[in-house]
C-alpha cells in the first residue's frame, strides 16, 4: 500500500511585511492523500479558532488538493511573529510558517535630561527607528541645525520576537552655549515622532 | 490614503477582447487576495474572479469560466483583468476589490454591436 | 454555490427609526459575512466584516450579528445619509456571492 503524502505551497511569500492597522491573507493550498484529518493555524502556541478557513480546490471525488487561508486583519505592532499552519492525516503530518513583520511608526519611549548632561532619546518601532538631533537657539521649534549623536544603540526589546525595535541615542548638552530647544527626530519607512526639549522649560512631545 | 484605479473599460463589440487594469496604492498590494465584482445596470453586485497574494493560484465564477482570465503584477501593485469572448451579458461596471473591504470606482465595459 | 437571499427587498422608514435588514445563506458560511452600503453612482462601502466587526470610520450605529446561515445588519437610529441598497456578501470556501440587496428608502 503506498504511504501517504502531504505537500504544502505557500501563496504568499511565507516572510510577510505588512503595514500597521493592514490586513493580510495567509493562503496555502496543499496535496493531501489520504485526505485531511486535521488543520489548523498557529500563534505564539495559541490555536486559531476562526479567521481562517479550509477548503478543497473542487469538488471532484478525486480531488487531493485543498486550500487554508488565514485572513489576519487591522494588524498591530504587537502581532508581528510566526504564523504556523498544521495539517495531517492518518499517515504525515506537515506545516508551514509565516513569519510576519508588523511596520509600525516610531515612538518616542523616553526623552530624558542626564544627571551627566546628556540628552537620551530612545525610541521604538519597525523597521528600526533613526534619530537624528537639532538645535535651534530661542524659543523657535523649527530646528534645522543638526547634532551629532555621542553614543546610539539598538536595544534588545523585551517584547516577543518580530516585534518593535528600540534605539537609543545620546547627545551632549554641554556642547549648546545658548538656551534653546533640542529635537529628537525619530524616523523610519512608515513615518516620523518628534520630541523637543526646550533648555529654559519643561519637556514636551509633540507627535507628528 | 488607500486608492484602487480602474482603467481599460469602453465599448466593445461581442466575442472582442478588453484588458481591465487596477493600479493600487496606499497599502500592502503584494499581501492582499484581490478580485474583481461587476455590476449590470440597474443591478446587483456579482463577484467575477479572484487572485491569491502570489498570483500562483485563480477562482472563477462559473459564468466567465474559460473566458477570463484574472492576473497581477505584486512589482507594479497592478491588478488585471482579461476578458474574451465577451458577450452582451457581460456589459457591467467592473470593480477591483480587496477580500478586506477596500474598492475602486469602477471602469464600465459595454459589449454591443 | 452558496445562495444568498436578503429580506426585505424593499424597507421604508422614517429618519431616526431603527431598521432591520436581513441575510440568510443557503449553507453555513461560518461568520465570513460581510454587509456592504452603496449609493447610486458610488461604489461600495464596506460596513461590516466577519459577521459583527465595524470597518474602520463606520459610525456605532450599524451592527452586524449572527453566524452559520442567519445574519443581521441593525441600524439603530436612521440618518438621512444611511438611505441608499445593502448587500450581504459571504466569502466561504474559496468563493464569494452576494445578496440581491435591501433598498432602503425614505418613508
Known amino acids: 500500500v503506498d504511504k501517504g503524502f502531504i505537500n504544502i505551497f505557500p501563496m504568499i511569500n511565507t516572510t510577510v511585511f505588512v503595514n500597521d492597522g493592514e490586513n493580510v491573507d495567509l493562503i496555502v493550498e496543499y496535496e493531501a492523500f489520504p485526505k485531511p484529518e486535521h488543520q489548523q493555524w498557529i500563534y505564539m502556541n495559541r490555536t486559531f479558532t476562526d479567521k481562517w478557513e479550509d477548503y478543497p480546490k473542487s469538488e471532484n471525488e478525486s480531488n487531493i488538493r485543498y486550500v487554508s487561508e488565514l485572513h489576519l486583519t487591522r494588524l498591530k505592532g504587537t502581532e508581528g511573529g510566526t504564523y504556523t499552519f498544521l495539517v495531517s492525516n492518518s499517515d504525515v503530518n506537515a506545516a508551514i510558517a509565516f513569519n510576519v513583520y508588523v511596520n509600525t511608526k516610531p515612538e518616542i519611549l523616553t526623552y530624558d535630561r542626564l544627571v551627566n548632561g546628556m540628552l537620551q532619546c530612545v525610541a521604538a518601532g519597525f523597521p528600526e527607528p533613526t534619530i537624528d538631533w537639532y538645535f535651534c537657539p530661542g524659543t523657535e521649534q523649527r530646528c534645522s541645525a543638526s547634532v551629532l549623536p555621542v553614543d546610539v544603540q539598538t536595544l534588545n526589546s523585551s517584547g516577543p520576537p518580530f516585534g518593535k525595535l528600540v534605539v537609543q541615542s545620546s547627545i551632549d548638552s554641554s556642547a549648546f552655549k545658548h538656551n534653546g530647544t533640542v529635537e529628537c527626530k525619530a524616523y523610519n519607512d512608515v513615518g516620523k515622532t518628534s520630541a523637543y526639549f526646550n533648555f529654559a522649560f519643561k519637556e514636551q512631545i509633540h507627535p507628528h | 490614503e488607500v486608492q484602487l484605479l480602474e482603467s481599460g473599460g469602453g465599448l466593445v463589440q461581442p466575442g472582442g477582447s478588453l484588458r481591465l487594469s487596477c493600479a493600487a496604492s496606499g497599502f500592502t498590494f503584494s499581501n492582499y487576495l484581490m478580485q474583481w465584482v461587476r455590476q449590470a445596470p440597474g443591478k446587483g453586485l456579482e463577484w467575477v474572479s479572484g487572485i491569491v497574494p502570489s498570483g500562483g493560484s485563480t477562482v472563477y465564477a462559473d459564468s466567465v469560466k474559460g473566458r477570463f482570465t484574472i492576473s497581477r503584477d505584486n512589482s507594479k501593485n497592478t491588478l488585471y483583468l482579461q476578458m474574451n469572448s465577451l458577450r452582451a451579458e457581460d456589459t457591467a461596471v467592473y470593480y477591483c476589490?480587496?477580500?478586506?473591504?477596500?474598492w475602486g470606482q469602477g471602469t464600465l465595459v459595454t459589449v454591443s454591436s | 454555490d452558496i445562495q444568498m437571499t436578503q429580506s426585505p427587498a424593499t424597507l421604508s422608514l422614517s429618519p431616526g427609526e431603527r431598521a432591520t435588514l436581513s441575510c440568510r445563506a443557503s449553507q453555513s458560511v461560518s461568520s465570513y459575512l460581510a454587509w456592504y452600503q452603496q449609493k447610486p453612482g458610488q461604489a461600495p462601502r464596506l460596513l461590516i466584516y466577519d459577521a459583527s466587526n465595524r470597518a474602520t470610520g463606520i459610525p456605532a450605529r450599524f451592527s452586524g450579528s449572527g453566524s452559520g446561515t442567519d445574519f443581521t445588519l441593525t441600524i439603530s437610529s436612521l440618518e438621512p445619509e444611511d438611505f441608499a441598497v445593502y448587500y450581504c456578501?459571504?466569502?466561504?470556501?474559496?468563493?464569494?456571492?452576494f445578496g440581491q440587496g435591501t433598498r432602503l428608502e425614505i418613508k
Open positions: 456578501q459571504q466569502r466561504s470556501n474559496g468563493g464569494i456571492t
Open positions: 476589490a480587496t477580500r478586506g473591504g477596500y
